[in-house]
């Protein structure tokens, strides 16, 4: 039975040109995390394999940095980055857990910054 839960930063906003950390945390399970995929609806941003390390999709290589931890740092944000992001935890023996984050990239300099996962 899958007992785990994914905690995410939820809905966050950031300024155009700025950076943001996408972060998820899997709790309430002893399952081993073998891989975390960071995805948008139709494409892969990055993979963090527990053994093999990181893969960054080429279309994001210039402005995505791995970490901290299993998180993902998005840099040089544009309004086109607004949308849903998914962290997909591949675990053994539980299977797959998915978390959702909605990022809004604002033109304004008064973007409400999303708490502890926000880069200053």
């Amino acid at each position: 039975m899958m007992t785990g839960t994914i905690e995410t930063t939820g809905n966050i906003s950031a300024e155009k040109g700025g950076s943001i950390i996408l972060q998820c945390h899997l709790s309430s399970t002893t399952a081993q995390v073998t891989q975390v995929n960071w995805e948008q609806q139709d494409q892969l941003l990055a993979i963090c394999n527990a053994d093999l390390g990181w893969h960054i999709s080429p279309s994001f290589k210039d402005r995505v940095a791995p970490g901290p931890g299993l998180g993902l740092t998005l840099q040089s944000l544009t309004v086109n980055d607004t949308g849903e992001y998914f962290c997909i935890y591949h675990t053994y023996p539980d299977g797959t857990y998915t978390g959702r984050i909605f990022l809004e990239v604002l033109e304004s300099s008064v973007a409400e910054h999303g708490a502890r996962f926000q880069i200053p």
Epitope: G53, H55, P58
Partner: antibody, heavy 119, light 107 residues
Amino acid sequence: QVQLVQSGAEVKKPGASVKISCKTSGYTFTEYTLHWVRQAPGQGLEWIGGINPNNGGTSYAQKFQGRATLTVDTSTSTAYMELSSLRSEDTAVYYCAGSGYYDYSFAYWGQGTLVTVSS
Amino acid sequence: DIQMTQSPSSLSASVGDRVTITCRASQDVKNAVVWYQQKPGKAPKLLIYSPSYRYTGVPSRFSGSGSGTDFTFTISSVQPEDFATYYCQQHYSTPFTFGQGTKLEIK
């Protein structure tokens, strides 16, 4: 330029083990993940597993779990693949392959090592 | 494990022909697919990755496309040196798996 140079051909008896080396040069050894792929005569490509030289982390295809062992020697920039309990079906060319920085594509390949298992 | 099914398994073409190879993943692999070329007795060579980027030095006649489960590899105008076997591979999740290969032969 990046180079992966493998050890020479081996002939082994069933039940024996073989250890193949893959000496790398032309890049920082700990930056690229190294994988092992095999190809039986006239057949396709089969991923055995990969190793992250940065931390020694290994991932294996389930078929090879417990029978293949991937290791690295960072002092000589060399990767090793040992396959135990050999059987005739393990006769194949074994390749080491390197994937680039933050990448899982196999951009760099060794020349291959033919392992023949025969009694 | 994710299965990669390539078709056709072989095809014949003449120099100058346009050829297309398809690869279907048994589940969504997003854009985590690459294509290799292999000639007899040689190691494979990376041609296309993710799945529409040409690797360094790869001629523009080679191209790739697709996302999700369906991927296509195309040679726009086959040259004599292109007769070889081509493989797709997914790296969305381990174990990384290959298609069974497509042998491109001279007609």
